[in-house]
Amino acid sequence: CKAMHVAQPAVVLASSRGIASFVCEYASPGKATEVRVTVLRQADSQVTEVCAATYMMGNELTFLDDSICTGTSSGNQVNLTIQGLRAMDTGLYICKVELMYPPPYYLGIGNGTQIYVIDPEPCPDSDF
């Protein structure tokens, strides 16, 4: 297993609709490779997998239909979008990139993006 550098933004603020987007960039030493991107959430020293996708470098990446993540890829960059976030989902979201095949296998883990989610204030009832 060889190490690979992965870069991602330090902080992202989710939109009022609970959507957060960030770029995960990896320094790939190989050519066309099967790549696996995993988003991990770290909160209170617990790490859980949010979503994962495997794709061919240069092609689109597809998450499972029921995934809360969507994304596009361009070269060595993956543009990730996480939806349906609520205040309780605030935490550190880590991008993990694996160059799966062919060997050599490379693994890179970013420092994480702190995503802040603020639940929108409920709209006050109004008389028309």
């Epitope: 030493p29 050519k31 066309a32 490779t33 099967e34 799966m100 095949y101 062919p102 060997p103 050599p104």
Partner: antibody
Amino acid sequence: QMQLVQSGAEVKMPGSSVRISCKASGGSFTTHFINWVRQAPGQGLEWMGWMNPNTGNTGYAERFQGRVTLTRDTSISTAYLELSSLRSDDTAVYYCARNPAESGRFDPWGQGTLVTVSS
Amino acid sequence: QSALTQPPSASGSPGRSVTISCTGTSNNVGGYNYVSWYQQHPGKAPKLMIYEVTKRPSGVPDRFSGSKSGNTASLTVSGLQAEDEADYYCGTWDGSLNAYVFGTGTKVTVL
């Protein structure tokens, strides 16, 4: 013990296509990558490409790009190699072989399929 | 893609040893411990004899051993037997080509 069994010999006309099958038994089809290698008469081994049976993703040797297609049918644990625009120098024995993701070993190998291209 | 370089032939008397070399570059043989060796008898499929430079699959006699120094890998067959007469190929992944490369092949003759 995993076994790979390939389809029988083929005789093809120049310009046509050939499709070879490689059926896996005795183990999980989707956990290891399938590679294809060919050997022309009296020549050495030549790697053609790989396929991930789990995702269907493929990678090809540069010289075969555009002429080779690797596919699979996971329901019958079978991988396929299709080679198009056949020429006489494509006459060879074609082998499939299994490769764990983080290893350089090809094991086991199919018994081979002889493809003869002749008019 | 360019093949790894092997001597075309090697020979030895029964009971003696023979060593086959496989020379590549830092992108393949020298860069990773992925070198495998395959034995091929006429009309048969290749058989894995050594993988990851030194490892032997179960069922392969311990007369077969592998090693590596720099960009050159070697296969040694000690205590040669008649059934060891075959073609031997090295193979490894090439990190710059993202391809598997084989050696040119060595015909081993037991005298």
